[in-house]
């Protein structure tokens, strides 16, 4: 049959509707919205009004899969896939839908958070226009004589902060491992601070194809977990491989968010200052940003 | 009815090069997730790739990261397997499988019949 | 990488037996494990997803359980055509590594 089957594992929103017949829906993390009356007009997008105390609250119950299909919303977000959109959605009570496959290329600067921001999807559009996909921070000059996408990334004021980039080439500054991204419109990403070595091996370094090492900046990207940790720290999920540069990543079942440990000489959210470095580095296919 | 069909398999010498074809038919082929799994001679089950829907996102097993690159043609219905730098232990039977993914997850519910690839000096 | 680690590796029981295989992931998985029969020089058959959702037209004989790491596929009454080597296979996210396999044979 062309269509996939019910209740793949997990629940991407297919337990309030009765389908996902393949876990005990009540045993699900909740994920409670800003709700204060729980009715049908208020706990909709795959909520639930469940008791809780005095009152019943829309619970969103969702375990989403973590697998890395990026979708773009409606509202501008990226999301690391349908399920985590959904979740979204129903979190907001507020409806979101997929408007293209892929990141949207549009950056409105928004961190890795849940989507506060309004977005009208009328409003939202992927940058294609006449020079067909920008990325990486590149913009469409229509104007010149041979269309196509320009880099207007200026790194000289940046100082000398050496990376090793998954090009396997060595750049004088974070800014200059964006600039070439943006210049070949490919993903190049840090892989660490300091020049290549001969120990980094090229072929594991990650060429264009090397399937993703770091994912755009993704909205509602936190992994809803049914093993019992409250209050412990417990290993990442596999979708944010990465998101410790020289540390180890730990997830936090309680608030639901990842933190490093840093190894020694580093600090920073993602363990990737040095002592002397005032070097802030999110590594993401789409940007780099810099403090 | 859906099929798979594996194609390119083949006797290569170390260290050559080799693409792997999966013609597909039977479904929307953007609909579904198109993975590489491969099976040496007596052994068990590997996974090897997959490439989702519009061809951006792509994962590798890491024994074959750098040196194998899945591809998707969407308008031909076709998934490929481009291998370079063959190992001795890549040889396999290697298929094709598709999974849809999206608001939840599912796993391989049609194969292809397999395509072996020998790699030998 | 998660690991998956199936148990036992082979085993031999009588036709009318109950068989039971178990399959571990190294990190909580939720439930998006699957289990796979291959019949010698065959394809690869799906049997369940979901850990426990027996996929459309295999004999309801075959069963699945578990949650977060621990799983078992159970065969209630073996029968001569369950000869096979059973799989299991995570797809939470990539990698999709499958358990080493358990081969299943008639005393």
């Known amino acids: 049959s062309n269509q996939p089957p019910g209740g793949g594992g997990g629940s991407g929103g297919d337990c309030p509707g009765g389908k996902g017949k393949s876990i005990n829906c009540s045993e699900l993390n909740v994920r409670e919205s800003d709700v204060r009356v729980c009715d049908e007009s208020s706990c909709k997008y795959g909520g639930v009004c469940k008791e809780d105390g005095d009152g019943l609250k829309c619970a969103c119950q969702f375990q989403c899969h973590t697998n890395y299909i990026p979708v773009c919303g409606s509202n501008g977000d990226t999301y690391q896939n349908e399920c985590f959109l959904r979740r979204a959605a129903c979190k907001h009570q507020k409806e979101i839908t997929v408007i293209a496959r892929g990141p949207c290329y549009s950056d409105n600067g928004s961190g890795s958070g849940e989507g506060e921001e309004e977005g009208s999807g009328a409003e939202v559009h992927r940058k294609h226009s006449k020079c067909g996909p920008c990325k990486y921070k590149a913009e469409c000059d229509e104007d010149a004589e041979n269309v196509g996408c320009v880099c207007n990334i200026d790194c000289s004021g940046y100082s000398f902060n050496p990376v090793c980039a998954s090009d396997g080439s060595s750049y004088n500054n974070p800014c200059f491992v964006r600039e070439a991204s943006c210049i070949k419109q490919e993903q190049i990403d840090i892989r660490h601070l300091g020049h290549c070595t001969d120990t980094d091996d090229t072929s594991l370094l990650g060429k264009k194809d090397d399937g993703l090492q770091y994912r755009p900046d993704v909205k509602d990207a936190s992994d809803q977990r049914e093993d019992v940790y409250i209050g412990n720290h417990m290993p990442c999920p596999e979708n944010l491989n990465g998101y410790c540069i020289h540390g180890k990543c730990e997830f936090i079942y309680s608030t639901q968010k990842a933190s490093c440990r840093c190894e020694s000489g580093y600090t920073g959210q993602h363990c990737e200052k040095t002592d002397f470095s005032i070097l802030y580095v999110v590594p993401s296919r789409q940007k780099l940003t810099h403090v | 009815q859906v099929q798979l069909v594996e194609s390119g398999g083949g006797v290569v010498q170390p260290g050559r090069s080799l693409r792997l074809s999966c013609a597909a038919s039977?479904?929307?082929?953007?609909?579904?997730?198109m993975h590489w799994v491969r099976q040496a001679p007596g052994k068990g089950l590997e996974w090897v790739a997959v490439?989702?829907?519009?061809?951006?996102?792509?994962f590798y097993v890491d024994s074959v990261k750098g040196r194998f690159i899945i591809s998707r043609d969407n308008s031909k219905n076709t998934l490929y397997l481009q291998m370079n730098s063959l190992r001795a232990e890549d040889t396999a039977v290697y298929y094709c499988a598709r999974a849809y993914c999206g608001g939840d997850c599912y796993p391989f519910d049609y194969w292809g019949q397999g395509t072996l690839v020998t790699v030998s000096s | 990488d998660i690991q998956m680690t199936q148990s036992p590796s082979s085993l031999s029981a009588s036709v009318g037996d109950r068989v039971t295989i178990t399959c571990r992931a190294s990190q909580g998985i939720s439930n998006y494990l699957a289990w796979y029969q291959q019949k010698p020089g065959k394809v690869p058959k799906l049997l369940i997803y979901?850990?426990?959702t027996l996929q459309s037209g295999v004999p309801s004989r075959f069963s699945g359980s578990g949650s977060g790491t621990d799983f078992t596929l159970t065969i209630s009454s073996l029968q001569p055509e369950d000869v096979a080597t059973y799989y299991c296979q995570k797809y939470n996210s990539a990698p999709w590594t499958f358990g080493q396999g358990t081969k299943v044979e008639i005393k």
């Open positions: 979901a850990a426990s």
């Open positions: 039977g479904f929307t082929f953007t609909s579904y997730g």
């Open positions: 490439v989702w829907y519009e061809g951006s996102s792509k």
